[in-house]
Interface confidence: low
C-alpha cells in the first residue's frame, strides 16, 4: 500500500460498498501522487478501533461515546477531523446536553432528588448517559442495577426503552416506556413535551431541542437551564450553562504516526469534490443503501481538529466525567459536602519541590501534579488531572478561553483588609541600563530584548501588543536583533540570549535561568539592552535584596524606565512611566472546583501566608528566594474577587482586547484548541 493511502475502516457490507465507491471516485479526481483510499472491513466499531491501534487501518468516524473508547489505553487514538453541521459560515461541530426546567419551579441541579424526570431514551447521550453519569455519585446505593438507582433517585420518570416490568417508576410518566415515536414522550421532542405538559419537572435534551419545539421567544422565556454550578440561565445561554459539550461525529486516528495531515488532506479534497451539492454521481454525505454510512448524512463538511487536542480535551471534562462514572462506577468515599484535596499544578522541578513541601505541611489538603509548561498545566486542570494554579494575566486569558475561572487574586500591597480588596493591578515596565543613555521607546529596533516568557503580561502581551500597533506585523524576532523570550521557537533569535543548557534552553519554566521576572532582569544585567518586567522587579533584585551572585551588588540607581512618550525616568517613578497596568496574577480552576479551591486556599494562607514571620524554619507559601515559585514572592495575600469572577471581568475589557489583537501573532496551540471548542 503506497505511503499516501488512508485505510478507511468500514463496519458493514453497506459501508464497505460505499467505501469502495468513495475510493474509486477519489481516484478519478485526485492526481496519482495525491492521497488515496483503501477499504478495510471489520465487524464492529470496536474492532475498527483495535485495527487502527494495531496499524491495520488508519481512520474511522465515531460518535462521542466511541471516541472515549478509542482514547482509552491500549487504543490511544485521537480525534483528527470533525464533521460539521449547519452552514460553512457558522459550522457546528458540537451539541450541548442540557437540563431544561420551567421558569417558576425554583430548584437547582443539586436539588434534583425527588423530582420527576424526562429522558429522550435509556442509554442515549444527552437524555441519559450524560445527566445520569454526572448525577451518578448522588444516586442512592447500591448503584447497580443503574435503572433501579435512578428510579429511587427521581420520584417518577419517563425513560423510553427502559424495562417497565422491572423498573415501573422509569415508565411512570409515559406508561409502557415505548421505544419509538409511538410513545409521545420519546426522543428529544418527546422529552421536552413531557416537561411542557407538566408530567415532569426536568427534561434532559440537547440545546437545539427548545428552539426546534418553540419558535416563539416569549414561549422559550418560560423555560430555563439548570447549570452545574447550581444556578439557572436563560435557554439561549446554553454555551455557559450545560451538562456537557459533546462532539457530534469525529474521525479518529493513531496518536503517533497516525497520518493526520494525510487524512485531513484526503477529506478536505473529498468534500470539495463530493461534499454537499457538489456531485451527482457520488455524495460523501448521503447513504442510498442505508443511513449514516461512513459519515452522518446530515453533515455539511469537515473541519480539522487542532493538533494540540487530545480526546480528553476534545470530549471535555464534563462528558469524560459522566462516561467514566457510568463505565467505572466508582465514587469518592468522602461525603460530598467535604472538599477533596486540591491538586496543585507545579511547573518543572523547582516548583515541584516547593509544592511537595506545601503538601506535607498542609496535612493532605494539597496534592501536587507536575507539568513542563504553563499550557500543559492548564490542560491538566481542564481534564481533571490537576485542579488549580496561580497564573499571570496572559495565561488567565488562555485558561479563561479554555473554560477555567479565576477564584482568588494575588495582592501585592499590605493593607488591613487585604483578603477583601483585590487590587487594580501592577505596572508593566521597560527597564534599561542608565549607562545606555541614548536608548528610548522609539529606537528599540535592533536592540537585545529580555522577556519573562511568551504569552505573559508584562513580559510579552503588553510590550509586544504596543509594538504590534506600531510595526503592524508579528515578526518580533526581526525587530529585535536577539533576545530571550522563553517559549519562543528554539531556532528563533528570541532564544539566542537565553542561558538554559541543552533542552532547557528557552523553556518557559525555571530550568531556563532567564525565565520569569527575575530571569528577564538578570538577562538585562548580563546580556540585554531592555527588559520587560513588572514595576517591583528592579527594587526586589537590587540593594542586596537578592543574594544570588549575579544580583548581590546591583544598585537600583543604575537602571531607568522607558516611557511611551520617548522619555526616561528613574525606577521609582513607575506610576508616571509604564507601558500599561497589568491585572494581578490569579488562581484559576474548573468551575466545579471553584468553591473548594476558594475554601482550602483561604485556610492555607491563614496557616502559611505572610503572617508567618520566620521563613527559615517554617513553610512560607509566598516565598521562594525571588524565584516566584507557585506564587509571586511579593504576594501579601490571596484576595476574593467579588463579582470579577470570569476571565473577562477579571482581566478587564481593555486587556482582553489587547490580548485579542495580539492573537494573530499567537503561537499558542492550546488557545487554538480551546477556540475550536468555543470559537
Amino acid at each position: 500500500v503506497p505511503d499516501k493511502t488512508v485505510r478507511w475502516c468500514a463496519v458493514s457490507e453497506h459501508e464497505a460498498t460505499k467505501c469502495q465507491s468513495f475510493r474509486d471516485h477519489m481516484k478519478s479526481v485526485i492526481p496519482s501522487d495525491g492521497p488515496s483510499v483503501a477499504c478495510v472491513k471489520k465487524a464492529s466499531y470496536l474492532d475498527c478501533i483495535r485495527a487502527i491501534a494495531a496499524n491495520e487501518a488508519d481512520a474511522v468516524t465515531l460518535d462521542a461515546g466511541l471516541v472515549y473508547d478509542a482514547y482509552l489505553a491500549p487504543n490511544n487514538l485521537k480525534p483528527v477531523v470533525a464533521e460539521f453541521y449547519g452552514s460553512k459560515e457558522d459550522p457546528q461541530t458540537f451539541y450541548y446536553a442540557v437540563a431544561v426546567v420551567k421558569k417558576d419551579s425554583g430548584f437547582q441541579m443539586n436539588q434534583l432528588r425527588g423530582k420527576k424526570s424526562c429522558h429522550t431514551g435509556l442509554g442515549r447521550s444527552a437524555g441519559w448517559n450524560i445527566p445520569i453519569g454526572l448525577l451518578y455519585c448522588d444516586l442512592p446505593e447500591p448503584r447497580k442495577p443503574l435503572e433501579k438507582a435512578v428510579a429511587n433517585f427521581f420520584s417518577g420518570s419517563c425513560a423510553p426503552c427502559a424495562d417497565g416490568t422491572d423498573f415501573p417508576q422509569l415508565c411512570q410518566l409515559c406508561p409502557g416506556c415505548g421505544c419509538s415515536t409511538l410513545n409521545q414522550y420519546f426522543g428529544y421532542s418527546g422529552a421536552f413535551k413531557c416537561l411542557k405538559d407538566g408530567a415532569g419537572d426536568v427534561a434532559f435534551v440537547k440545546h437545539s431541542t427548545i428552539f426546534e419545539n418553540l419558535a416563539n421567544k416569549a414561549d422559550r422565556d418560560q423555560y430555563e437551564l439548570l447549570c452545574l454550578d447550581n444556578t439557572r440561565k436563560p435557554v439561549d445561554e446554553y454555551k455557559d450553562c450545560h451538562l456537557a459539550q459533546v462532539p457530534s461525529h469525529t474521525v479518529v486516528a493513531r496518536s503517533m504516526g497516525g497520518k493526520e495531515d494525510l487524512i485531513w488532506e484526503l477529506l478536505n479534497q473529498a468534500q470539495e469534490h463530493f461534499g454537499k451539492d457538489k456531485s451527482k454521481e457520488f455524495q460523501l454525505f448521503s447513504s442510498p443503501h442505508g443511513k449514516d454510512l461512513l459519515f452522518k448524512d446530515s453533515a455539511h463538511g469537515f473541519l480539522k481538529v487542532p493538533p494540540r487536542m487530545d480526546a480528553k480535551m476534545y470530549l471535555g471534562y464534563e462528558y469524560v466525567t459522566a462516561i467514566r462514572n457510568l463505565r467505572e462506577g466508582t465514587c469518592p468515599e468522602a461525603p460530598t459536602d467535604e472538599c477533596k484535596p486540591v491538586k496543585w499544578c507545579a511547573l518543572s522541578h523547582h516548583e515541584r519541590l516547593k509544592c511537595d513541601e506545601w503538601s506535607v505541611n498542609s496535612v493532605g489538603k494539597i496534592e501536587c501534579v507536575s507539568a513542563e509548561t504553563t499550557e500543559d498545566c492548564i490542560a491538566k486542570i481542564m481534564n481533571g488531572e490537576a485542579d488549580a494554579m496561580s497564573l499571570d494575566g496572559g495565561f488567565v486569558y488562555i485558561a479563561g478561553k479554555c473554560g477555567l475561572v479565576p477564584v482568588l487574586a494575588e495582592n501585592y500591597n499590605k493593607s488591613d483588609n487585604c483578603e477583601d480588596t483585590p487590587e487594580a493591578g501592577y505596572f508593566a515596565i521597560a527597564v534599561v541600563k542608565k549607562s545606555a543613555s541614548d536608548l528610548t521607546w522609539d529606537n528599540l529596533k535592533g536592540k537585545k530584548s529580555c522577556h519573562t516568557a511568551v504569552g505573559r503580561t508584562a513580559g510579552w502581551n503588553i510590550p509586544m501588543g504596543l509594538l504590534y500597533n506600531k510595526i503592524n506585523h508579528c515578526r518580533f524576532d526581526e525587530f529585535f536583533s536577539e533576545g530571550c523570550a522563553p517559549g519562543s521557537k528554539k531556532d528563533s533569535s528570541l532564544c539566542k540570549l537565553c542561558m538554559g543548557s541543552g533542552l532547557n534552553l528557552c523553556e518557559p519554566n525555571n530550568k531556563e535561568g532567564y525565565y520569569g521576572y527575575t530571569g528577564a532582569f538578570r538577562c538585562l544585567v548580563e546580556k540585554g539592552d531592555v527588559a520587560f518586567v513588572k514595576h517591583q522587579t528592579v527594587p526586589q533584585n537590587t540593594g542586596g535584596k537578592n543574594p544570588d551572585p549575579w544580583a548581590k551588588n546591583l544598585n537600583e540607581k543604575d537602571y531607568e524606565l522607558l516611557c511611551l512618550d520617548g522619555t526616561r525616568k528613574p525606577v521609582e517613578e513607575y506610576a508616571n512611566c509604564h507601558l500599561a497596568r497589568a491585572p494581578n496574577h490569579a488562581v484559576v480552576t474548573r468551575k466545579d472546583k471553584e468553591a473548594c479551591v476558594h475554601k482550602i486556599l483561604r485556610q492555607q494562607q491563614h496557616l502559611f501566608g505572610s503572617n508567618v514571620t520566620d521563613c527559615s524554619g517554617n513553610f512560607c507559601l509566598f516565598r521562594s528566594e525571588t524565584k516566584d515559585l507557585l506564587f509571586r514572592d511579593d504576594t501579601v495575600c490571596l484576595a476574593k474577587l467579588h463579582d470579577r469572577n470570569t476571565y473577562e471581568k477579571y482581566l478587564g475589557e481593555e486587556y482582553v482586547k489587547a490580548v485579542g489583537n495580539l492573537r494573530k501573532c499567537s503561537t499558542s496551540s492550546l488557545l487554538e484548541a480551546c477556540t475550536f471548542r468555543r470559537p
Partner: nanobody
Framework: EVQLVESGGGLVQPGGSLRLSCAAS????????MGWFRQAPGKGLEGVAV????????YYADSVKGRFTISEDNSKNTVYLQMNSLRAEDTAVYYC?????????????????????WGQGTLVTVSS
C-alpha cells in the same frame, strides 16, 4: 514570523508564458495550503491555484485548468505558478497566500478566507 515574497510578474503578449515564484520563510514548510490568488482591476479576489505543501495535491480554478501549473521546490520553500497560453482576462495582481493554523479549517482550499498570510502581490499584464 512568516513572510511570503513573490516575483516574476510583468508584461506579456496574449498566448505567451510567465512563471511566478513565491518564497516562504519563517515557518516549518510542509503540511499547509499555499497558492495563488488574483485580483483583476475592479473585481474581487479569485482563487487561481493551490497546493498542499510537502508533496500534496493541487487544485485549480476552472478558468485556468490546462493552462496554469502550480508546483513546489521543497528545498527552497518555494511555490511556482507556470502560466501558459495567457489571455487578456488573466491580467491582474497575483498574490501568493498561505493558510496556517486555524485558517485551514475553511472547507475550500480556493477560498481566500482560509488564508491568513499574504504576499505583497505582483502585477501580470497580458496585452498586445
Amino acid at each position: 514570523e512568516v513572510q511570503l515574497v513573490e516575483s516574476g510578474g510583468g508584461l506579456v503578449q496574449p498566448g505567451g508564458s510567465l512563471r511566478l515564484s513565491c518564497a516562504a520563510s519563517g515557518h516549518a514548510y510542509g503540511g499547509n495550503y499555499m497558492g495563488w490568488f488574483r485580483q483583476a482591476p475592479g473585481k474581487g479576489l479569485e482563487g487561481v491555484a493551490v497546493l498542499y505543501t510537502g508533496g500534496g495535491s493541487t487544485y485549480y480554478a476552472d478558468s485556468v485548468k490546462g493552462r496554469f501549473t502550480i508546483s513546489e521546490d521543497n528545498s527552497k520553500n518555494t511555490v511556482y505558478l507556470q502560466m501558459n497560453s495567457l489571455r487578456a482576462e488573466d491580467t491582474a495582481v497575483y498574490y501568493c497566500a498561505l493558510a496556517l493554523g486555524s485558517a485551514r479549517w475553511y472547507t475550500s482550499s480556493l477560498d481566500a478566507r482560509a488564508y491568513n498570510i499574504w504576499g505583497q502581490g505582483t502585477l501580470v499584464t497580458v496585452s498586445s
